[in-house]
């Protein structure tokens, strides 16, 4: 007889990452039957939000509903009806909200009350709005990249499934960019973490993990860039700022008001003159190399070592995944294949910046001119900040893998939040069951 | 101190619609929160869904969404909750109370003195 | 949804008696928790907020406790005033709920 699919017993999760400049809804799938086995959860979608950061409707929060409607509608159609009620929807806002926090409470709060007000209007198990730490990003897209490469399994195979496989147990450090923050994570080599607040101590599938996080807040790709416009302003002669982050013949007029409404750029804030600036661009990647240089401290250190404005650095170990907008910005500069060494990619910053904005914008007519003007300073900053802030060296510049996917999820992270709140990663080994329940009869 | 006052009872027939009002005196809605629970007679206390009246911001219990329609109007300080396809067991007590803070702090901290709604043919 | 169970169903106390109530919560409301007293023919009245604070103008013999899932009311010495209905209700997530009600009576 013809064997019969039984009904697949699976289970959904839903997790919004409201970053600074824009909001992204996943949904993941697994079995419900192997729910604390190492590596069965998997993206099944990712729904972008049109428009910006949730903290930028602050002053219109009357609109949050309906920026939220078309992937909340994505996910009703996606999921099975059956299994909405079940479906647990949790939204983590990062950075962008850490700073509107310390702007204003109240007004991060509001924002946060609107939201958990629109998505409880779905038919999900909405498990609320929260600002994530910056310890919780780094370690959740640490347990992500993890959980997706197989280094929690305790089976060790001698075939690789997934890239970037090692073919051991070693884990994989995370290096995550955002808009507003950055974070670096990972397992350092037999060393004391000397800053506590540094310190994260997991125990997962039997195992116990001395993890060294942290998150720099404002170092992020567009806080990064308001930090250097600010630092630049203060020292320019009248209100042209000869920028060497920009391709040459790049003009671009920013209100003051604007450069100073970000607490990133209140160490730089000072009276000017005029009320606005015009960028034009110059196009030398060594010169904005050296801009962006002036925003990491490296004076100080109370710490054996340092990463830069006084934050404890291990020693780096091991192989990372650079992902999020490490990846992106990469991957648009076609930066992103394992063969390409540290000096090369130099090379080609180089290079770029230096090509006329005439030139950039007709070879690239289908990229927005707000991304396509700032890959030119986002690459030069992830570099400056990989090889001075981190101390990647030409050398180790090789251990660093810029990733978008592992299996066919994303890198970052929702998935390892979302791993956590439903219990999903057991602190000690499953008993391991020798056959899986038939799905066919 | 703020009160709020309630429209008055209801005998309404089944499948029709009931629209209660609940006004706010000696005070301003501000960024409040006004919330419609419901009680049956001898039974326990239910929330239906709220309202920013500031923003026109309503959510609700997914049991009542598609029948329930929370407004407000800010000029006369007065919120209303329309409820329609009655039947039976929508007989009951409703009432407004105020929600006293914002994000996460959604305690009842002022009520209403209810309105009755009676649903019978 | 979060399902707030309260316990026990019916308490019978005589004045001046200490009185405990308990509600539980489904999963963690951290202390995102409130207490209402209920007579007769009236609204509910806010007694207790943040799983431990009085609102404004609660006698002292109130007091609430507890946090995560386990909460619990006690009226260290009961007045005739205060058997009435009591119910709990958690403001962590959305949809609020609501305890099925403890009714104290007197014994």
């Known amino acids: 007889t013809q064997n019969k699919a039984l009904p697949e017993n699976v289970k959904y999760g839903i997790v919004l990452d409201a970053g600074s400049s824009h909001t992204s809804l996943y949904i993941y799938k697994w079995p419900a039957e192997k729910e604390n086995d190492t590596g069965v959860v998997h993206q099944v979608e990712e729904c972008r939000v049109k428009g910006p950061g949730i903290s930028k409707f602050v002053q219109k929060v009357n609109e949050i509903g309906i920026y939220l409607t078309d992937c909340m509608e994505r996910a009703r159609e996606v999921i099975p009806r059956s299994q909405h009620q079940e479906t647990p929807v949790y939204l983590g806002a990062t950075a962008g909200m850490r700073l509107l926090r310390m702007e204003s409470e109240e007004l991060a709060d509001r924002v946060l009350d609107v939201v958990e007000r629109s998505l409880s209007n779905y038919p999900f198990d909405f498990q609320g709005a929260r600002i994530i730490t910056g310890q919780e990003e780094g370690a959740y897209g640490w347990i992500t990249i993890n959980y997706l490469l197989g280094k929690f399994s305790q089976k060790t195979r001698w075939f690789s499934i997934v890239p970037y496989e090692t073919n051991n147990q070693e884990t994989f450090g995370a290096l995550d960019l955002g808009g507003a923050s950055t974070q670096v994570t990972f397992v350092p080599q037999n060393q004391t973490i000397e800053s506590p607040d540094n310190a994260l101590q997991f125990r997962l599938y039997g195992k116990d993990y001395n993890v060294y996080t942290h998150s720099f807040l404002c170092y992020g790709k567009d806080q990064a860039l308001w930090q250097k416009l600010a630092k630049d302003i203060q020292v320019a002669s009248n209100e042209i700022l000869r920028d060497p982050c920009f391709h040459p013949g790049y003009k671009k007029v920013v209100n003051v008001s604007d450069l100073y409404k970000t607490p990133c750029t209140k160490r730089f804030e000072m009276t000017l003159p005029f009320q606005q600036f015009e960028i034009q661009g110059i196009g030398n990647y060594q010169q904005c190399h050296q801009s962006i240089l002036e925003l990491f401290n490296t004076s100080y250190c109370p710490y054996s070592q340092c990463a830069f404005n006084g934050i404890f650095l291990p020693p780096l170990q091991g192989d990372f995944g650079a992902f999020s907008a490490f990846y992106f910005v990469m991957k648009f500069l076609n930066l992103t294949s394992e063969k390409v060494s540290q000096e090369k990619v130099t090379e080609m910053m180089k290079k770029f910046c230096a090509q006329p904005w005439e030139e950039i914008k007709t070879s690239y007519a289908g990229v927005k001119e707000k991304y396509l003007s700032e890959y030119c300073f986002s690459g030069t900053y992830i570099l400056s900040l990989l090889l001075q802030g981190y101390h990647f060296t030409a050398d180790s510049w090789e251990h660093i893998h810029f990733i978008g996917k592992i299996q066919g999820s994303d890198a970052g992270w929702t998935l390892g939040y979302m791993l956590n709140l439903t219990n999903m990663i057991p602190a000690e080994q499953p008993l391991s069951t020798p056959l899986s329940h038939s799905t066919y009869v | 101190q703020v009160q709020l006052v309630q429209s008055g009872a209801e005998v309404k027939k089944p499948g029709s619609s009931v629209k209660v009002s609940c006004k706010a005196s000696g005070g301003t809605f501000e960024s409040y929160g006004i919330s419609w629970v419901r009680q049956a007679p001898g039974q326990g206390l239910e929330w239906m869904g709220s309202?920013?009246?500031?923003?026109?911001?309503?959510n609700y219990a997914q049991k009542f969404q598609g029948r329930v329609t929370i407004t407000a109007d800010e000029s006369t300080s007065t919120t209303y909750m329309e409820l329609s396809s009655l039947r039976s067991e929508d007989t009951a007590v409703y009432y407004c109370?105020?929600?006293?803070?914002?994000?996460?702090?959604?305690?009842?901290?002022?009520w209403g003195q209810g309105t009755m709604v009676t649903v019978s043919s | 949804e979060i399902v707030m169970t309260q316990s026990p169903a019916t308490l019978s106390v005589s004045p001046g008696e200490r009185a405990t109530l308990s509600c539980r919560a489904s999963?963690?409301?951290?202390?995102?928790l409130a207490w209402y007293q209920q007579k007769p023919g009236q609204a509910p009245r806010l007694l207790i907020y943040g799983a431990s604070t009085r609102a404004t103008g609660i006698p002292a013999r109130f007091s609430g406790s507890g946090s995560g899932t386990e909460f619990t009311l006690t009226i260290s010495s009961l007045q005739s005033e205060d058997f009435a209905v009591y119910y709990c209700q958690q403001y962590l997530l959305w949809p609020l709920t609501f305890g099925g009600g403890t009714k104290v009576e007197i014994k």
């Open positions: 999963q963690s409301v951290g202390s995102n």
């Open positions: 309202i920013i009246p500031e923003f026109g911001i309503a």
């Open positions: 109370a105020r929600e006293s803070g914002g994000y996460r702090d959604h305690r009842l901290d002022v």
